[in-house]
Interface confidence: medium
């Protein structure tokens, strides 16, 4: 898609440091020392690939944006309005390098791009791969993909929710609901009807992806074998089996519970039933009550028995405004008896209650094991009607755009480096070029990679 | 048993129009498109075009484009293929044909597992 | 003229393995699937490969499918007097927006 620029733009002094200290680790060579300078240069894929943009041509040149209206929306709100750009981060450390900017927020955004050529699930895997900066935070919206079937119909100006896709894949959050979607659409092969897959949640922890301001690439790898892989920053954060791994399951099960199965009426479920040879004692008192006064029991000494626990307040006044006709006799609210404060109590003492030893209550007969249990009932199981195998879910519907169709409440999502690919190297490579270069720009390069990005730079200068 | 029956052989003059059915059975006909064939005696296959029978939409050859319609009664579970303006070179044996039940991407077509018996529509003045 | 090649002959004795070539463009099998039919004389077309390579239940595993490229071939080995037939070749193409078949290739078993 994205030709690669000319423009050659040095990265700011941090990076040239980082890249000073790892020149300085290589042998000396008879050359004359001079300062090492890197350079921002667009990526270029290296090999085929089916889609590629990196932006820095600086135009949304091979994008369409929407002229759709969503369905089911009132009108003011169910245009595609939301603005696009394509510019460089507010807080980039690499001047030139530009990417897909969301820009406003509260509105339905969508832009969409053909691919080279469609993507047919056959042979060879599919690798789907972006970059993610949510520059101001994301407090609900998402920021996925989605590749958009391959159908007659397609047409990219009118671009909607409802635009079949065959895969949706990324990141989306709301409130402290951090997701990362990878949903594919399977054609029931019974019923001709599709219904989205979703993968099981990432045992990783989601939230500084979206928190920490920095840019994340995403990757996507799901191979003819039906396996699949989902990587953030080049790390595995979930990964599976078409077949086994996805919600609803992608085939059904083989039987079903009958519908039409009803519990017999003396069907016994009871583990337990209380013994019906079991006799109440003769001494069993069932009406000796559970509590009584404590005998034992002494009123404490110094407990004021003709001390009220409450009494008027002596230094409440009756309100200028109260009206004895109309509001009643006036009282002194009342409060606690500061004499009963160094006391160990006031008014009249009670006993205090006690369990009662002697207390059985009703009495039960004992439970025995029910010599007619039959067990929980269940129905018996069936043949499904709508049982299908089908063991090659990776053999999806082809698709031939990518589209970007999103809301947030959060602006300047920025959006980089989209590559989709049938070859792992080719796309690593694109990451080095691109997002590597980003994260060492950072200062977060792990010790080495920086280095390895200078040999890759040698070896495909 | 899955299959589609056809309307029996047309002889038509130049200028007319013939429209051929095709009743599916064994199969819910509401969730496959149908698509129509024809060959022209010793000549390669030929795409007309196709229905969704759920909904109705169609798709026709540019080739034939103006004059062909297809349509379809679900009440009947029938797809019928109507081509106007005949001419000679219209005389083949038209086909109706189903999707392959386990290509879930009918949308796109090309894998017909269910043809019908083949209808001779023959053109001649 | 076709818009997919393929010869108009082939032939193999029993036993023998028969490869049958389909020749197209980009806009056909280069960006779509290929699929292709078994048609004896008098009766409608059989699916024999569907997605460049996959056989319908009931269909042998004699018969296999490859694409590579804008191309595409059908293969038949263990050759049987009942394969004679034409065999064709068909792939959507998106610059036409319809599908496409070849002219056909007779298979003779001799």
């Known amino acids: 898609h994205d030709g690669h620029d000319d423009d050659v733009i040095d990265i700011e002094d941090d990076l040239d440091d980082v890249i000073e200290e790892v020149e300085d680790s290589k042998p000396d060579t008879t050359a004359p020392p001079s300062s090492p300078k890197v350079t921002y240069k667009a990526p270029v894929p290296t090999g085929e690939v089916y889609f590629a943009d990196s932006f820095d041509r600086g135009t949304l040149s091979g994008w369409i944006l929407s002229k759709a209206k969503k369905d089911d929306t009132d009108d003011e709100i169910a245009k595609y309005d939301g603005k696009w750009e394509v510019e460089e981060m507010k807080e980039s450390k690499l001047p030139g390098d530009k990417g897909l900017v969301l820009m406003s927020r509260a509105k339905h955004h969508a832009i969409s791009a053909k691919l080279n050529k469609p993507f047919l699930f056959d042979t060879k895997p599919l690798i789907v791969q972006y970059e993610v900066n949510f520059q101001n935070g994301i407090e609900c919206g998402g920021a996925y993909v989605k590749l958009l079937s391959k159908t007659p119909e397609l047409n990219l100006d009118q671009f909607h929710d409802k635009t079949p896709y065959t895969i949706m894949f990324g990141p989306d959050k709301c409130g402290e609901d951090y997701k990362l979607h990878f949903i594919f659409r399977h054609k029931n092969p019974k019923t001709g009807i599709y219904e989205e897959k979703h993968a099981k949640r990432p045992d990783a922890d989601l939230k500084t992806y979206f928190t920490d301001k920095k840019t994340h690439l995403y990757t996507l790898i799901l191979n003819p074998d039906n396996s699949f892989e989902i990587l953030v920053d080049q790390s595995v954060v979930n990964s599976g089996n078409l077949l086994n791994d996805m919600t609803p399951p992608v085939n059904p099960s083989r039987e079903i519970e009958d519908p039409e199965d009803r519990k017999p009426e003396d069907w016994d479920e009871r583990p337990k039933i209380p013994d019906p040879e079991a006799v109440k004692p003769d001494d069993w008192d069932e009406d000796a009550p559970a509590k009584i006064p404590d005998e034992e029991a002494t009123k404490p000494e110094g407990w004021l028995d003709d001390e009220p626990e409450y009494v008027p307040d002596p230094d409440a006044e009756k309100p200028e405004d109260w009206d004895e006709d109309m509001d009643g006799e006036w009282e002194a609210p009342q409060i606690a008896n500061p004499r009963c404060e160094s006391a160990p109590g006031c008014g009249v003492w009670q006993r205090p209650v006690i369990d009662n030893p002697n207390y059985k209550g009703k009495w039960k007969p004992p439970m025995i094991d029910n010599p007619s249990y039959q067990g929980i009932w269940k129905p018996r199981k069936i043949p499904n009607p709508d049982f299908f195998e089908d063991l090659e879910p990776f053999r999806m519907t082809p698709f031939s755009a990518i589209g970007l169709e999103l809301w947030s409440m959060t602006s300047d999502i920025f959006f980089d480096n989209f590559i989709i690919c049938a070859d792992r190297r080719i796309v690593d490579d694109w990451a080095n070029d691109g997002w590597g270069l980003k994260k060492a720009a950072d200062g977060a390069a792990e010790p080495g990679v920086v280095g390895q990005m200078i040999e890759a730079a040698e070896e495909r200068p | 048993e899955v299959q589609l029956v056809q309307s029996g052989a047309e002889v038509k003059k130049p200028g007319a129009s013939v429209k051929v059915s095709c009743k599916a059975s064994?199969?819910?006909?509401?969730?496959?498109?149908m698509h129509w064939v024809r060959q022209a005696p010793g000549q390669r296959l030929e795409w007309m075009g196709w229905i969704n029978a759920g909904n109705g939409n169609t798709k026709y050859s540019q080739k034939f484009q103006g004059r062909v319609t297809i349509t379809r009664d679900t009440s009947a579970s029938t797809a019928y293929m109507e081509l106007s303006s005949l001419r000679s070179e219209d005389t083949a044996v038209y086909y109706c044909?189903?999707?392959?039940?386990?290509?879930?991407?009918?949308?796109?077509?090309?894998?017909?597992?269910?043809w019908g018996q083949g209808t001779t529509v023959t053109v001649s003045s | 003229q076709s818009v997919l090649t393929q010869p108009p002959s082939a032939s193999g004795t029993p036993g023998q393995r028969v490869t049958i070539s389909c020749s197209g463009s980009?806009?056909?099998?280069?960006?779509?699937?290929v699929y292709w039919y078994q048609q004896l004389p008098g009766t409608a077309p059989k699916l024999l490969i569907y997605i460049n390579d996959q056989r319908p239940s009931g269909v042998p595993d004699r018969f296999s499918g490859s694409k590579s490229g804008t191309s595409a071939s059908l293969a038949l080995s263990g050759l049987r007097s009942e394969d004679e037939a034409d065999y064709y070749c068909?792939?959507?193409?998106?610059?036409?927006?319809?599908?496409?078949f070849g002219g056909g290739t007779k298979l003779t078993v001799l």
């Open positions: 044909a189903r999707v392959l039940h386990v290509l879930r991407y009918f949308d796109w077509p090309g894998a017909f597992d269910i």
């Open positions: 064994g199969y819910t006909f509401t969730s496959y498109a």
């Open positions: 068909a792939a959507w193409d998106d610059s036409l927006s319809g599908l496409v």
């Open positions: 980009s806009s056909n099998i280069g960006t779509n699937y």
